[in-house]
């Protein structure tokens, strides 16, 4: 039975086996085509989601589709039902929390009262000015809180108490990539993790431990990537894994927050990386223990210099490392989070690519998560 499962796939009607390597190869080998059903699927970027959250106290903004202008949501007459609608528009299914925060004198966007129409937030027609003088601060999910704060050092062993959103993504019980829990159903990782194996069956997620072998595996229902863009082959290195059963959150299993749409991190901003990846370039072995390291944002211009990546780093990527080199993500860390701490921890990057590991002029290159928020929200909405 184990051997059969490992090397063969059972087609139905009529029942017969096909070699597992014929799964997800683009050819219908089973009469009903089920060999091409449970495969990595691509999902387009989709339309603009008409709500977003700002790094200014997680305040809600709403798009006026007629003009293309964004507006801040006034707290006047804002209700729990409107909060739920806003979060559903971003694909969240959990119960949101919201509060009033004072408008500041440097408020740039205009402020409008919000209403609902066909399960979408809209600006209320001919509403008055914002009498409360307050904006809506909205949290769709409790996220980004860990039991333990890491110390700022170079590289050290990590505890799952510090990084309860970190998961190991495994194929045939072998660790392939890292990933981050975003909500009970969804894990964020890199698309390139699935290049070799595009069948969903053998992929598993392990959560809740900092040791590689020691935690139960979770079945995966779907793996979703963005359509490949041949113009920018290294772009779109992002994937969402939908778990078959929702996670139960605990001290060691918790979600990390997505970044705000306007989360612009300046060079030298401190960030953290974690993973079970190789501890040496081109050799060594996977680390059995989760490792953590503090790095910093490296300016894209510097990263694209002639002695570095020579223009390969696009606007949808970011670089991080330490200027003198020596601290970096490596093979096996792919898909894991690049993290920023404000009030909560945010996954601002996904470990993607780089030349070597830890070189001074070639730091790690990360998928910029804020560039894909729209895609993430559209995937979640489609799967609600």
């Amino acid at each position: 039975k184990v051997i059969l499962d490992k090397y063969y796939f059972l087609c139905g009607q009529p029942l017969h086996f096909i070699p597992r390597k014929q799964l997800c190869d683009g050819e219908l080998d089973c009469p009903l085509g089920e060999d091409e059903e449970h495969c990595v699927k691509s999902f387009p970027e989709g339309p603009a989601v008409a709500v977003r959250l700002s790094k200014d106290r997680s305040t809600l903004q709403v798009l006026d589709s007629a003009t293309g202008n964004w507006f801040s949501a006034c707290f006047d007459n804002f209700t729990e039902a409107l909060a739920e609608t806003a979060c559903r528009q971003m694909g969240y299914s959990s119960k949101p929390t919201f509060r009033a925060v004072e408008i500041g004198p440097d408020q740039d966007l205009d402020v409008v009262e919000i209403t609902e129409n066909s399960q979408e937030l809209r600006m209320r027609n001919s509403s008055g000015p914002c009498l409360s003088g307050s904006l809506v601060s909205l949290h769709c999910l409790a996220c980004g809180k860990s039991l333990k704060t890491p110390r700022v050092v170079g590289v050290e062993e990590a505890s799952v108490d510090s990084w309860p959103w970190q998961v190991s993504i495994q194929y045939d019980k072998q660790h392939v990539c890292g990933g981050s829990i975003l909500d009970p159903h969804w894990v964020l990782t890199a698309a390139h993790c699935f290049r070799k194996h595009t069948d969903v069956f053998n992929w598993k997620v392990r959560a809740g431990s900092d040791k590689l072998g020691s935690f139960p595996s979770l079945a995966v229902a779907k793996i979703i990537i963005i359509e490949f863009n041949p113009m920018y082959p290294k772009d779109n290195d992002i994937a969402l894994m939908k778990l078959q059963f929702p996670l139960t959150f605990s001290g060691t299993v918790r979600p990390i927050c997505l970044p705000f749409f306007d989360e612009e991190l300046t060079p030298a901003t401190p960030l953290w990386i974690i993973g079970w990846g190789f501890t040496k370039q081109n050799g060594g072995k996977m680390s059995d223990i989760l490792l953590q390291a503090s790095v910093q944002v490296i300016d894209s211009t510097r990263c694209n210099a002639d002695d570095a990546y020579q223009g390969e780093v696009t606007e949808k990527m970011m670089c991080a490392g330490i200027p003198e080199g020596g601290v970096d993500t490596c093979q096996g860390d792919s898909g894991g989070p690049l993290m920023y701490q404000s009030d909560q921890w945010h996954v601002v990057g996904i470990v993607s690519w780089g030349y070597g590991c830890g070189g001074p002029s070639t730091p790690g290159v990360y998928t910029k998560v804020s560039a894909y928020l729209n895609w993430i929200y559209n995937v979640w909405k489609a799967e609600l």
């Epitope: 408020q107 001919s126 008055g128």
Partner: antibody
């Protein structure tokens, strides 16, 4: 684009009243507070009060309490400022000014062209 | 009421000069401060709000700074079209109050 067009110049006798209008266009009239500010010849700017065009609610500077009345007509998107018991020191250019965003504490951004009111016997 | 005191009341400068105008509030106003430019016979024009935010369409040679009670408007390189009167204004509390104005004249 946002426009505030005020009524023409007025000459009034002391003790009389004047009513200045300010017609708004290019935006949702009810969504923004409107201030009235005046400027005597060769002098600085003096705030008179505000009106909420949605509710008609007003707030006046202490100096003008009892003499000033601000009203609005939502059907024509027009606000009015009436000043009574005029005296010579009320000779000034009167401006209506809309706030930058729909919030009371944002500064006036859009201004009318001004209405000169001359009080002379 | 919050008093706004501007200085100097007038100044003479040449094209290309760096010009600084100060405004002092009689009590703390956080950063609820705006600056206006007014030319003769025209309505005031908003240059800066929230102490340092440049209003859209205003040249970057204008900048604002300060907080609490002391504020500054700086014109980094005076241009011919900048000769005008400048007012500060607080919107921290009603009544809104303006400074007395600073007239920038050609030397």
């Amino acid at each position: 684009q946002v426009q505030l067009v005020q009524s023409g110049a007025e000459v009034k006798k002391p003790g009389a009243s004047v009513k200045v209008s300010c017609k708004a266009s290019g935006y949702t009239f009810t969504g923004y507070y409107m201030h009235w500010v005046r400027q005597a010849p060769g002098q600085g700017l003096e705030w008179m009060g505000w009106i909420n065009p949605n509710s008609g609610g007003t707030h006046y500077a202490q100096k003008f309490q009892g003499r000033v009345t601000m009203t609005r007509d939502t059907s024509t998107s027009t606000v009015y400022m009436e000043l009574s018991s005029l005296r010579s020191e009320d000779t000034a250019v009167y401006y209506c000014a809309r706030v930058r965003i729909g919030w009371l504490q944002s500064p006036p951004l859009y201004w009318g062209q001004g209405t000169l009111v001359t009080v002379s016997s | 009421d919050i008093q706004m005191t501007q200085s100097p009341s007038s100044l003479s400068a040449s094209v290309g000069d760096r010009v600084t105008i100060t405004c002092r509030a009689s009590q703390g106003i956080s950063n609820y401060l705006a600056w206006y430019q007014q030319k003769p016979g025209k309505a005031p024009k908003l240059l800066i709000y929230a102490t340092s935010r440049l209003q859209s369409g205003v040249p970057s040679r204008f900048s604002g700074s300060g907080s609490g009670t002391d504020f500054t408007l700086t014109i980094s390189s005076l241009q011919p079209e900048d000769f005008a009167t400048y007012y500060c204004q607080q919107s921290y509390k009603t009544p809104l109050t303006f400074g007395g104005g600073t007239k920038v004249e050609i030397k």
